[in-house]
């Protein structure tokens, strides 16, 4: 919908979770609402309770199974409805046909670690979490490094246009504290978006050796 005040947006993490946000100006704060998922070719259906995340926005996670189980495929369509209680009955507030692999947002990368650090460079690795085997190598990453005296928003983005779960940061300043974050995105999906940023990894470059050029 073009109207930004009222939206029902959901993303699939590629395995067993559909996360939804429902925003609605003027909606009643104390009304009980839920998201109901009905797949077109599966025997299960699932419901989650919408909980407030701001004054006019609610969110919930449809847990479809064990975290690493592949619950949906590229041919699945899931009808998602927002239902709110009105007295003794439930009223449909919003509806959409959700194509999971057109609306992907993966989990943030995990297990960030410093593989090797020197005075001017640092090699960092990470892992992707709960990502479908369907992607094979069709993933890309963005990374950013927080330098002293700067904000994350000012940090330049480094783009890795392939499934590469490591990076070598160069031209760093010796004996300096940095933080590093990475996020991931599948190449598939018309409405696919970047994962959240990973938890920041703090590291410090080695001090320059005394009496040597830096």
């Amino acid at each position: 919908a073009v109207n930004g005040t009222s939206q029902f947006t959901c993303f699939y993490n590629s395995r067993a979770n559909i996360s939804c946000v429902w925003s609605q100006d003027g909606a009643l704060q104390d009304t009980s609402c839920q998201v109901h998922a009905w797949p077109d070719r599966r025997r299960w259906n699932q419901t989650c309770e919408l909980l407030p995340v701001s004054q006019a926005s609610w969110a919930c996670n449809l847990i479809l199974g064990a975290p690493d189980s592949q619950k949906l495929t590229t041919v699945d369509i899931v009808t998602l409805r927002v239902l709110c209680r009105e007295g003794v009955r439930w009223r449909v507030m919003a509806i959409q046909d959700f194509k999971p692999f057109e609306n992907l947002r993966l989990m943030a990368p995990i297990s960030l670690q410093v593989v090797h650090v020197e005075t001017h460079r640092c090699n960092i690795s990470w892992e992707i979490s709960q990502a479908s085997h369907y992607f094979e190598r069709h993933l890309e990453f963005e990374a950013r490094t927080l330098s002293p005296g700067h904000t994350w928003e000012e940090a330049p983005l480094l783009t890795l246009k392939q499934k590469q779960e490591w990076i070598c940061l160069e031209t760093l300043t010796p004996d300096t504290q940095y933080e590093f974050q990475v996020r991931v995105k599948p190449l598939q999906g018309e409405f696919t978006t970047w994962s959240p940023w990973s938890q920041p990894l703090a590291f410090r470059t080695k001090p320059a050796a005394l009496g040597k050029d830096t």
Epitope: A1, V2, N3, S6, Q7, F8, T9, W22, S23, Q24, W38, D40, I77, T79, R81, V82, V92, M93, A94, I95, Q96, D97, K99, F191
Partner: nanobody
């Protein structure tokens, strides 16, 4: 952009049936929610029914449940509203509308609208 053109309106008697059609065109039609709304003279526009394009899932206003049926023909890019047991209260201009991604959180809010077709139910 989605273009919508309604047809099928006219003058009918109480208890009669009528079929409205909405021809849709545009790049995003295949993933849209398609709805029918109506506006009676001197009243606000109200939601009648909506259908999802891919699975054909439907939602109806209480006032038309059991009397009106919304359907779609994907091959023809057309949405229909079959109206039966018509009452004088059903007299209104009927509008076809489309909701495209990101989807609306409110059945009354749509992105694209047709110009409408008049249905008059006389007693």
């Amino acid at each position: 952009e989605v273009q919508l053109v309604e047809s099928g309106g006219g003058l009918v008697q109480v208890g009669d049936s009528l079929r409205l059609s909405c021809a849709a065109s545009g790049r995003t039609v295949g993933s849209a929610n398609m709805g029918w709304f109506r506006q009676a003279p001197g009243k606000e526009r109200e939601f009648v029914a909506v259908i999802t394009w891919s699975t054909g899932s439907t939602v109806y206003a209480d006032s038309v449940k059991g009397r009106f049926t919304i359907s779609r023909d994907n091959a023809k890019n057309t949405v229909y509203l079959d109206m039966s047991s018509l009452k004088p209260d059903d007299t209104a201009v009927y509008y076809c509308a489309a909701d495209v991604y990101p989807y609306s959180g409110n059945l009354n809010i749509m992105d694209y609208w047709g110009k409408g077709t008049l249905v008059t139910v006389s007693s």
